[in-house]
Interface confidence: medium
């Protein structure tokens, strides 16, 4: 058939939906690949065509938009399932074309099963709450566009398997779930089940997210360098291995980029003509405070290296700090004969 700009399989959009629930999937062409929207394309006389390849098959097939009760339909740039079936899993393609223009992209759709406690292979979004910070809310995600504002759905919230009723610090408020004060014990999976009527049928939307309680910005401090410090002196003889750890504590800060780096004589180690290796390890506390350790290593240190300035730097959204390591050349013990000779006044 005619040439078509093929964007291939967009694996960034690994769409997962629950079996036997409605799903609305927008054609990714207009969201990620083209510079114009569906309305513009439609006005210009371009046609949006959908087709799919079933799981474990190579054959491209049209989507049957003529199923009983309109189970699969298309509305503008949205493909609708009312509801999904397990065998809807496959790669879906939307193709935009007319006689002179063609562009298409495929994306994988996986219909997954859930158990009675909402466990499933679904990848869960994570919502972070600040510890002991006051009232915070999570909102039932990805339910926009499923029903008009005139429809009032019923929403039931669960923590794990348990319906949230009479919890001390967690209160369901429609599409929102309010945490009066968040504790580590509030970590876990929370599920909202949205039930709404449409054309004499009842549909359910299940949305699960993971709540992670993290350090509060009220308690956040600039990075703290635990090592190097003034109490430790790195005394080495030439030829020995020099190991200096830089250990930095970072308070949890939402969307902060935590950085640790060494300078040697004010330059990056890569810009110094010595054989330096730096190994990093990271650990987290329960509230996602972070401790980063960067160990600077020089296998065979020279007397020149021992005269250099070694400074550990750290930066977060809260500020930047630096600390120099105290590095010295070990003074060798005097040789016995010389010492004696000097002691007895020998010339």
């Amino acid at each position: 058939s005619e040439r078509c700009d093929d964007w291939g399989l967009d694996t960034m959009r690994q769409i997962q939906v629950f079996e036997d629930e409605p799903a609305r999937i927008k054609c990714p062409l207009f969201e990620h690949f083209l510079k114009f929207n569906y309305s513009t394309a439609h006005s210009a006389g371009l046609t949006l065509i959908w087709y799919w390849t079933r799981q474990d098959r190579d054959l491209e097939e049209p989507i049957n938009f003529r199923l009983p009760e309109n189970r699969i339909s298309k509305e503008k740039d949205v493909l609708w399932f009312r509801p999904t079936l397990l065998n809807d899993t496959g790669n879906y393609t939307c193709m935009l074309r007319n006689t002179t223009y063609c562009s298409k992209v495929a994306f994988p759709l996986e219909v997954v099963q859930k158990d009675s406690c909402f466990n499933s292979p679904m990848k869960l979004p994570v919502h972070k709450l600040y510890i002991e910070y006051g009232i915070q809310r999570i909102t039932c995600p990805n339910v926009d566009g499923y029903f008009p504002s005139s429809v009032k759905p019923t929403i039931t919230w669960y923590m794990g398997c348990y319906k949230i009723q009479n919890f001390n610090n967690v209160i369901p408020e429609g599409m929102n779930l309010s945490f009066l004060i968040a504790f580590i014990s509030n970590n876990g999976n929370y599920t909202c089940v949205v039930t709404y009527p449409e054309n004499g049928r009842t549909f359910h939307l299940t949305r699960t997210l993971t709540v992670k309680v993290v350090g509060s910005p009220k308690n956040a401090v600039p990075p703290v360098i635990h090592s190097p410090n003034d109490h430790v002196v790195y005394e080495k003889e030439p030829g020995e291995e020099l190991l200096i750890p830089c250990t930095v504590y970072f308070s949890f800060l939402m969307d902060s980029r935590n950085e640790v780096w060494w300078t040697i004589d004010g330059k990056k180690p890569d810009d110094i003509p010595i054989d330096v290796t730096i190994n990093e390890s990271i650990s987290h506390s329960r509230t996602e405070d972070e401790t980063r350790t960067q160990i600077l290593s020089i296998k065979k240190v020279t007397s020149e290296d021992l005269k250099r300035s070694y400074v550990c730097h750290a930066r977060s959204a809260k500020g930047e700090v630096a600390k120099a390591a105290t590095v010295k050349q070990k003074v060798p013990a005097p040789r016995y004969t010389v010492e004696l000779a000097c002691g007895f006044g020998a010339t």
Epitope: S1, H42, G45, T47, I49, Y51, E60, E61, P62, N64, F65, R66, L67, P68, E69, N70, S73, K74, E75, W80, R82, M95, R97, N98, T99, E198, N199, G200
Partner: antibody, heavy 119, light 108 residues
């Protein structure tokens, strides 16, 4: 402007088959569904089935299944509807219609082919 | 299958009058996949309205469609001589595609 041109009238005997063609001109043929609708004399419209030429997959109404074959030839921009085991109640005008670009409704129709079945 | 019932069977009106044609579905027509066609004697049907209320290319604005769920209406605000014909509603979202029995608009 897209046009659908159908083959000429047919007179058939009961038990035989008829194959009606529908040739598209003036636009992209393969990406739209071509459907078949019939109308018995003095009666309403009845959907028979359709095909999307780009994929070659047909689907048809249950009361025609086993008797109807819908095919398409992309090289000649032509769709075909073959109806077998003809009976007198199959006497009707048979229309092809394009399942439209912007609407999904039948926006362009052929002129119709009269098929008469009698012994 | 979705059964479409059109009423009235015949509508006798004069040019310039308003025509209101009804189409009732046995099941809800979701996604607004409902169309109206006009058929004049000896001619193929012509698409007037699709998606319940959207006018097809070249259709004058005296034709309008409305409704949702199971009840749909085609309104011709002022009848012109060429509007006297048979009108069919059709749902095209659910297989099998079905047409209503038609309403004949005739000159009084």
């Amino acid at each position: 402007q897209v046009q659908l041109l159908q083959s000429g009238a047919e007179v058939k005997k009961p038990g035989s088959s008829v194959k009606v063609s529908c040739k598209a001109s003036g636009g992209t043929f393969s990406i739209y569904a071509i459907d078949w609708v019939r109308q018995a004399p003095g009666q309403g419209l009845e959907w028979m089935g359709g095909i999307i030429p780009i994929f070659g997959t047909e689907n048809s109404a249950q009361n025609f299944q086993g008797r109807i074959t819908i095919t398409a030839d992309k090289s000649t921009n032509t769709a075909y509807m073959e109806l077998s085991s003809l009976r007198s109640e199959d006497t009707a005008v048979y229309y092809c219609a394009r399942n439209g670009a912007t609407s999904d409704a039948f926006d362009i129709w052929g002129q119709g082919t009269m098929v008469t079945v009698f012994s | 299958e979705i059964v479409l019932t059109q009423s009235p069977g015949t509508l006798s009106l004069s040019p310039g009058e308003r025509a209101t044609l009804s189409c009732r579905a046995s099941l809800s027509v979701s996604s607004n996949y409902l169309a109206w066609f006009q058929q004049r004697p000896g001619q193929a049907p012509r698409l007037l309205i699709y998606g319940v209320s959207r006018r097809a290319t070249g259709i004058p604005d005296r034709f309008s469609g409305s409704g949702s769920g199971t009840d749909f209406t085609l309104t011709i605000s002022r009848l012109e001589p060429e509007d006297f014909a048979v009108y069919y509603c059709q749902q095209y979202g659910s297989s099998p595609l079905t047409f209503g029995g038609g309403t004949k608009v005739e000159i009084k």
